[in-house]
Interface confidence: low
């Protein structure tokens, strides 16, 4: 459900990844969107500590830009999803091994909560930058 509002990012986890005055989409399906989305990032971020140095920065960028999507202040505030190409680059290039492990763990039900599922975008469902360059965010 894409009901929410635009606000400046005031969290800590994604400070180094998001632009200084980034306008992000806060989803009002959560009672406290800022806190809930920050917790999502924080939980997933901790799991990234064990991934390779090549994967980590790319995964952090993907994670922060997926959970705190860029917000377009329109007639109704709208989240701008990550471009499919950037998601696939992280999945197939920078983090191929880690992504496979994660998908296997998910398939076998080895995660304690569903929270990490919300942290990982499905690349195939994201818009391509070749369809409309303004319809998605570039990492």
């Amino acid at each position: 459900d894409n009901k929410g509002y635009c606000a400046q990012y005031r969290g800590e986890v994604c400070n180094a990844v998001l632009a200084k005055d980034a306008l992000v989409f806060l989803n009002t399906s959560y009672a406290d969107p800022e806190e809930a989305q920050e917790l999502l990032v924080h939980t997933a971020w901790n799991e990234l500590k064990v991934v390779s140095p090549v994967c980590r920065p790319a995964a952090e960028a993907l994670l922060c830009n997926h959970i705190f999507q860029e917000c377009s202040p329109g007639v109704v505030p709208t989240p701008i999803p990550i471009c499919r190409e950037y998601c696939l680059a992280v999945k197939e290039l920078f983090c191929a091994k880690e992504w496979l492990v994660m998908e296997e763990k998910t398939h076998r039900g080895l995660y304690r909560s569903e929270m990490h599922l919300l942290s990982v975008p499905e690349c195939s469902k994201l818009p391509s930058m070749h369809w409309d360059p303004t319809a998605c965010a570039r990492l």
Epitope: K3, G4, C6, Q8, L23, P73, G74, V75, P77
Partner: antibody
Framework: QVQLVQSGAEVKKPGASVKVSCKAS????????MHWVRQAPGQGLEWMGW????????NYAQKFQGRVTMTRDTSISTAYMELSRLRSDDTAVYSC???????????WGQGTMVTVSS | SYVLTQPPSVSVAPGQTARITCGGN??????VHWYQQKPGQAPVLVVY???DRPSGIPERFSGSNSGNTATLTISRVEAGDEADYYC???????????FGTGTKVTVL
């Protein structure tokens, strides 16, 4: 609390310009379009246009194209509406308004009376 | 450009129901908003997206929209409901907003 505070009443001569300000507080100013609406004495509401405070992009009603300019200063969370080549029928109350997460206008400024008279 | 037509006035006795219509070509395909404006005051949003009510607006205010007509219904009308009422739509093709002509509601 969330509010929009506008500048005070103005009296202008025909042919002059007027610039009305609208200061936002209590919410993220750059997160929502700011609209300008006017109402002539005894008349209905008339939408003039919007500004995207984040990008500075604007969209004006056909009627005001070429005469209206909407700007903003994000450092002080303030939107401006300037109307040039004023005529007597521009005498009206000018209001800023915004919709916080909905496409309707749920917050309004108190209005600024602009009188155009020779 | 898109035109919204409202009756100039509606009169209603206290405790009765007032219905204000807003006519527009295929208005049912658009989201309609309704505003109440009392003399010398800024408009107040009473119904948005056809039938949703902002917090603080009594349940007596309701809206519907289909075909070429949107309707604002005020049930159990009170003296304090006397005001001008305006419908509004966003015309997505032009990215412009349009207000209706306005209806003066008089409580007898």
């Amino acid at each position: 609390q969330v509010q929009l505070v506008q500048s005070g009443a103005e009296v202008k001569k025909p042919g002059a310009s007027v610039k009305v300000s609208c200061k936002a507080s209590g919410y993220t100013f750059t997160g929502y379009y700011m609209h300008w609406v006017r109402q002539a004495p005894g008349q209905g509401l008339e939408w003039m246009g919007w500004i995207n405070p984040h990008s500075g992009g604007t969209n004006y009603a056909q009627k005001f194209q070429g005469r209206v300019t909407m700007t903003r200063d994000t450092s002080i969370s303030t939107a401006y509406m300037e109307l040039s080549r004023l005529r007597s029928d521009d005498t009206a109350v000018y209001s800023c308004a915004s919709g916080l997460g909905i496409s309707a206008f749920d917050i309004w400024g108190q209005g600024t009376m602009v009188t155009v008279s020779s | 450009s898109y035109v919204l037509t409202q009756p100039p006035s509606v009169s209603v006795a206290p405790g009765q129901t007032a219905r204000i219509t807003c006519g527009g070509n295929n208005i049912g395909s658009k989201s309609v908003h309704w505003y109440q404006q009392k003399p010398g005051q800024a408009p107040v949003l009473v119904v948005y997206d056809d039938s949703d009510r902002p917090s603080g607006i009594p349940e007596r205010f309701s809206g519907s929209n289909s075909g070429n007509t949107a309707t604002l219904t005020i049930s159990r009308v009170e003296a304090g409901d006397e005001a001008d009422y305006y419908c509004q739509v966003w015309d997505s093709s032009s990215d412009h907003y349009v207000f209706g002509t306005g209806t003066k509601v008089t409580v007898l």
